[in-house]
């Protein structure tokens, strides 16, 4: 049988073991109603997720446990999340302190990596936005996505500035995923 | 010849058939001027797309027809879209009804999956944002992207809350794509 | 040994040479403080990037030089960037000219392709947003990502409407990446 991988590529290269794409670690998690939980004083609270119902899934040894996606294999991963926020602001931008405009309210999403051997979490991605809508109910998403080199055993989580503002009503509005490239 | 795929991976694994990356179904579609079309009363209208001019392409049996991307092969796909909206709002946030702030205008993008064997479309991704700009011409994008397990024969489309607000002037502002991982 | 790639796929197919995923060109670049540089009058200025410290990396012949990511191999790439902007606007939306609302301030990110054989850049992706916040310090991200067919030797850069508004304080807020699919 003709084996395509025996062709000589146009540039000199040492091939790592080949593997089928279908067996790579992958996960897409979707929002659930958040239960109030403790979080460290200087750290934004982490969201927990649905990992098997509806559109959500984990596969090929990518596991979800206790707010964390567990990375089962070292490599380059594309990691993404969208969080839809909703709230009610009261003319925040018109309040002035000492003659200067006030610091507006904001919404923030952080995708964080935790490595057991390292005490401090690493912020991989941050989306942060000031919110200053004049007297209205507002809602808006923050989307993040990028590629990172992760190690087997790394853990990923999504932190937000205010859990009470997260829209948990629909699985297509707030989600979190990762896949090995 | 040294065959990389014969190396023993660090974990026990059954390999699915290998395949070259270059032959995977892929598409990147770009915006065109929308012609007014009928849509179901309770469903947002679907956009139609350029699929072969400029930056747009479909390849490896991924076809575009009648507003739909047709999935030719089961597997995990990364799906993305950006829609740039533009409009003119008139101080909507300052109108109060019965002493409460009004529900603001909004813009919404939904990436929807249609399966012939199932009557109801599935919303995969939604980006929705309140728009309440005080007396100005406004414009802004909504970006979405995530991974989903799709079946051969599934169809994907992009629905928006208001076609007349979609910026169709540049192919880099409003687009829709998918690729098999 | 059972070689998975000898299985007959469900559709007739000629396989291109297979290659390990780990040896594909990839890069994730992160923000640095920008030094004022010249740029062409009609073109937005390009950002320069960190390519090896912290979360930033380039690998497998994908190189970064002088604001450009160099594409070492033809193929389909997923390209992404987020730029976080921050600024201070002064009630711009309430200034009216000749009874009509003024054109609002805006922020724009463009991912651009440059081909040596052709002087004119091709805009691949654009995210553009009006900014009209009433008297406040504001901040917000623009995220972009999509798939493009690139040729060996192509160069990618990120241009922004105003370099002085780019938030360069954290590597997770403003970034740019690409990887061969």
């Amino acid at each position: 049988a003709l084996k395509g991988q025996e062709f000589a590529p146009s540039h000199q290269q040492v091939y790592a073991p080949l593997r089928a794409d279908g067996d790579k670690p992958r996960a897409h998690l979707t929002v659930v109603r958040q239960t109030p939980t403790q979080h460290f004083k200087n750290q934004f609270p982490a969201l927990h997720w649905e990992h098997e119902l509806g559109l959500a899934f984990t596969k090929n040894r990518m596991n979800y446990t206790n707010k964390f996606l567990l990375i089962p294999e070292s490599g380059d991963y594309f990691i993404y999340s969208q969080v839809t926020f909703r709230g009610m602001t009261s003319e925040c931008s018109e309040i002035r302190q000492a003659g200067r405009p006030n610091k507006p309210d904001s919404i923030t999403v952080v995708i964080t990596k935790v490595t057991d051997s390292y005490p401090e979490p690493t912020q991989l991605l941050m989306g942060t936005k000031s919110v200053c809508e004049v007297g209205s109910n507002w809602f808006q998403p923050i989307y993040l996505g990028a590629m990172f080199s992760l190690q087997e055993g790394d853990k990923l989580m999504v932190n937000v500035s205010d859990i009470s503002l997260v829209d948990y009503t629909k699985e297509d509005k707030t989600f979190f995923g990762a896949f090995l490239l | 010849a040294l065959k990389g795929q014969e190396f023993a991976p660090s974990h026990q694994q059954v390999y699915a058939p290998l395949r070259a990356d270059g032959d995977k179904p892929r598409a990147h579609l770009t915006v065109v001027r929308q012609t007014p079309t009928q849509h179901f009363k309770n469903q947002f209208p679907a956009l139609h797309w350029e699929h072969e001019l400029g930056l747009a392409f479909t390849k490896n049996r991924m076809n575009y027809t009648n507003k739909f991307l047709l999935i030719p092969e089961s597997g995990d796909y990364f799906i993305y879209s950006q829609v740039t909206f533009r409009g003119m709002t008139s101080e909507c946030s300052e109108i109060r009804q019965a002493g409460r702030p009004n529900k603001p205008d909004s813009i919404t993008v939904v990436i929807t999956k249609v399966t012939d064997s199932y009557p109801e479309p599935t919303q995969l991704l939604m980006g929705t944002k309140s728009v309440c700009e005080v007396g100005s011409n406004w414009f802004q994008p909504i970006y979405l992207g995530a991974m989903f397990s799709l079946q051969e024969g599934d169809k994907l489309m992009v629905n928006v809350s208001d076609i007349s607000l979609v910026d169709y002037t540049k192919e880099d502002k409003t687009f829709f794509g998918a690729f098999l991982l | 040994a059972l070689k998975g790639q000898e299985f007959a796929p469900s559709h007739q197919q000629v396989y291109a040479p297979l290659r390990a995923d780990g040896d594909k060109p990839r890069a994730h670049l992160t923000v640095v403080r920008q030094t004022p540089t010249q740029h062409f009058k009609n073109q937005f200025p390009a950002l320069h990037w960190e390519h090896e410290l912290g979360l930033a990396f380039t690998k497998n012949r994908m190189n970064y030089t002088n604001k450009f990511l160099l594409i070492p191999e033809s193929g389909d790439y997923f390209i992404y960037s987020q730029v976080t902007f921050r600024g201070m606007t002064s009630e711009c939306s309430e200034i009216r000219q000749a009874g009509r609302p003024n054109k609002p301030d805006s922020i724009t990110v463009v991912i651009t392709k440059v081909t040596d054989s052709y002087p004119e850049p091709t805009q691949l992706l654009m995210g553009t947003k009006s900014v009209c916040e009433v008297g406040s310090n504001w901040f917000q991200p623009i995220y972009l990502g999509a798939m493009f067919s690139l040729q060996e030797g192509d160069k990618l850069m990120v241009n922004v409407s105003d370099i002085s508004l780019v938030d360069y304080t954290k590597e997770d807020k403003t970034f740019f990446g690409a990887f061969l699919l």
């Epitope: - | 065109v32 392409f57 169709y168 | 091709t122």
Partner: antibody, heavy 124, light 107 residues
């Protein structure tokens, strides 16, 4: 500036094949498609087909389907049109033309740059 | 395929006169119609794209109008160099098709 330079005139016998080349310069070759148009002596313009220089996708006029093949080589920025099983009524000037696309959903553009033409004579 | 019919086949006019050329499509092509000029022994030249947009370097005396199935190319005041054959082309559906041409000749 944008330029399309075609290969030289050809004289062919009926049943033979001809392959005309079109070398592009002065623009991003992979962004703009290439159309091939022919013009028989004293006749009007006839569109033969289009190829995407971006990914090689083609559209051919029905009357040429099966007899024409359009290809590109991005490394040399060259488009090719091969016509097989030539007949005397294939005698014509063959043009390549750049399909301008303005990068806007509002426009479909037009063929804004043309090669100088290649005369193909089919005669026994 | 979409058939384009141009009229008249020949237009005999004097320099300075106004020329009106018509192109009718067998079905709607929206605004996706282009006009070309061809002089003897030369390659065609794009004049108008998307029904009404002048291509780069085309003088203002050339204008296009129409949408759907009926289109017009107007030359407001003929110059000596404008005497040539003019073709319309639809770009709405594959295969692209040309009209048979209108010859504008000196009266």
């Amino acid at each position: 500036q944008v330029q399309l330079v075609q290969s030289g005139a050809e004289v062919k016998k009926p049943g033979a094949s001809v392959k005309v080349s079109c070398k592009a310069s002065g623009y991003d070759f992979t962004y703009y498609g290439i159309s091939w148009v022919r013009q028989a002596p004293g006749q009007g313009l006839e569109w033969m087909g289009w190829i995407s220089t971006y990914n090689g996708k083609t559209h051919y006029a029905r009357m040429h389907q099966g007899r024409v093949t359009m290809t590109t080589d991005t490394s040399t920025r060259t488009a090719y049109m091969e016509l097989r099983s030539l007949r005397s009524d294939d005698t014509a000037v063959y043009y390549c033309a750049r399909e301008n696309y303005y990068g806007s959903g509002a426009y479909r553009g037009g063929m804004d740059a043309w090669g100088q033409g290649t005369t193909v004579t089919v005669s026994s | 395929e979409i058939v384009l019919t141009q009229s008249p086949a020949t237009l005999s006019l004097s320099p300075g006169e106004r020329a009106t050329l018509s192109c009718r499509a067998s079905q709607s092509v929206s605004s996706y119609l282009a006009w070309y000029q061809q002089k003897p022994g030369q390659a065609p030249r794009l004049l108008i794209y998307d029904a009404s947009n002048r291509a780069t370097g085309i003088p203002a005396r050339f204008s296009g109008s129409g949408s759907g199935t009926d289109f017009t190319l107007t030359i407001s005041s003929l110059e000596p160099e404008d005497f040539a054959v003019y073709y319309c082309q639809q770009r709405s559906n594959w295969p692209w098709t040309f009209g048979q041409g209108t010859k504008v000749e000196i009266k």
